[in-house]
């Protein structure tokens, strides 16, 4: 029995409703009592969603998962996956069998985007050029884990004296410190730039030194 | 409303080919297994050949296997019965037939194709 | 020779209780399911009884169907002259990979 997956990972919004697809071809002879359908956590083998003897056996997963009862017997055997969380993130194994036996897995990417990054000087008065200054860009509240990229004001990449750190909350969502040490010139913009990789979202922030006064755009 | 409408029935020569074709309206085609099933005069129906909603499974009876073929074009919504090295027996109104996988029935039938076989 | 046995014919009057057995094995009726279905003279075979008991919509509650190992049978109550007609159980066959037919039986109301 051929179990159709898409190839490419599932990627879902925290918070947000996602649907794993799985379908079969619908046989001759087939009906819905024949039906066995067993969704899992493809690692752990922990199931996930259960349909046999003609009927939905539920969720076995936190209450948050549902079949498409209207659409089975015509060979849809997609889950839905309600209010995702971090946690979710993996691989499920669609089982199906009527009278013969096929399987396939399909992935799920979790994501959740980034907020705008907030800019913060130290020290953030009586600046001079030749001054070394600490520009620090915090991002919070994304998945997976951010690319963080500095750049000044003609748009060179700022590659040196560069230090990230990533923490996950409660959640398993990213807080994003990202510290540039620069020395500063007569005057100068500079650029963060917070991408996360899976929704290839971009959140920008930025400071302008100008001698004095300096402005946080 | 679901309606399938064959066509392609008529008189052949023993040894003869034919091509049935059913054409389905009013349902997601793909979703759904389909059959030939025959009737000859004054008997009882006889299940001849189905095919899976894919295309890539098909079955066929013992009667039938290497001269007939069963067929589907999901694009066009239609299905197919190729018939060759016909024989007299083979004569029949032939019915295509969808199943319903909630019920495991078929529970739309065409009008009947009628195929003579006579030289 | 059909896979599937039927009574050649049945037979009633107006208001009688008439049953139609259909005998068969375990590789079709033991382990799958039975339908049932209706040809009254002329027209395309209907649809009558699907999952071994149930009815479609539209089939009136007179029609019953049962399955008791590897045999099935349908009742007809209060019978009624529309109802004169050939009616043929079918199962799917696991061995054979087939659906397969009973021979049909002819109700005839009296």
């Known amino acids: 029995l051929e179990v159709q997956v898409p190839e490419d990972p599932v990627v879902a919004l925290v918070g947000t409703d996602a649907t794993l697809c799985c379908s079969f071809s619908p046989e001759p002879g087939f009906s819905l009592a024949q039906l066995n359908l067993i969704w899992q956590l493809t690692d752990t083998k922990q199931l996930v969603h259960s349909f046999a003897e003609g009927q939905d056996q539920g969720s076995a997963y936190a209450n948050r998962t549902a079949l498409f009862p209207d659409l089975l017997a015509q060979g849809n055997a997609s889950l839905r996956l309600q209010r995702v969380r971090v946690a979710d993130e993996g691989s499920f194994t669609c089982f199906v069998s009527i009278r013969d036996f096929g399987s396939a897995a399909v992935s799920l990417q979790v994501a959740a985007p980034y907020s705008k990054p907030s800019m913060t000087l130290e020290p953030n008065k009586d600046l001079r050029p030749g001054d070394t200054v600490t520009i620090t860009c915090s991002s919070y509240r994304g998945y997976p884990e951010a690319e963080v990229f500095w750049q000044d004001g003609q748009g060179v990449p700022l590659t040196g004296n560069v230090t990230t750190s990533q923490m996950a909350n409660e959640q398993g969502l990213f807080d994003v410190h990202s510290v540039l040490r620069v020395v500063l010139g007569a005057n100068g913009t500079y650029s963060c730039l917070v991408r996360n990789p899976v929704l290839q979202q971009d959140a920008h922030g930025s400071v302008t030194i100008t001698g004095q006064p300096m402005t946080f755009p | 409303e679901v309606q399938l409408l064959e066509s392609g029935g008529g008189l052949v020569q023993p040894g003869g080919s034919l091509r049935l074709s059913c054409a389905a309206s009013?349902?997601?085609?793909?979703?759904?297994?389909m059959n030939w099933v025959r009737q000859a005069p004054g008997k009882g129906l006889e299940w001849v050949a189905g095919?899976?909603?894919?295309?890539?499974?098909?079955y066929h009876t013992d009667s039938v296997k290497g001269r007939f073929t069963i067929s589907r074009d999901n694009s066009k919504n239609t299905l197919y019965l190729q018939m060759n090295s016909l024989r007299a027996e083979d004569a029949a109104v032939y019915y295509c037939?969808?199943?319903?996988?909630?019920?495991?029935?078929?529970?739309?039938w065409g009008q009947g194709t009628t195929v003579t076989v006579s030289s | 020779q059909s896979v599937l046995t039927q009574p050649p014919s049945a037979s009633g009057t107006p208001g009688q209780r008439v049953t139609i057995s259909c005998s068969g094995s375990t590789s079709n009726i033991g382990y799958n399911l039975v339908n049932w279905y209706q040809q009254l003279p002329g027209t395309a075979p209907k649809l009558l009884i699907y999952?071994?008991?149930q009815r479609p919509s539209g089939v009136p509650d007179r029609f019953s169907g049962s399955k008791s190992g590897t045999s099935a049978s349908l009742a007809i109550s209060g019978l009624q002259s529309e109802d004169e007609a050939d009616y043929y159980c079918a199962a799917w066959d696991g061995n054979l990979n087939s659906w397969v037919f009973g021979g049909g039986t002819k109700l005839t109301v009296l």
């Open positions: 037939a969808k199943e319903d996988h909630w019920s495991g029935g078929m529970d739309v």
């Open positions: 095919i899976g909603g894919s295309g890539s499974s098909t």
């Open positions: 999952t071994n008991a």
């Open positions: 009013g349902l997601t085609f793909s979703s759904y297994a």
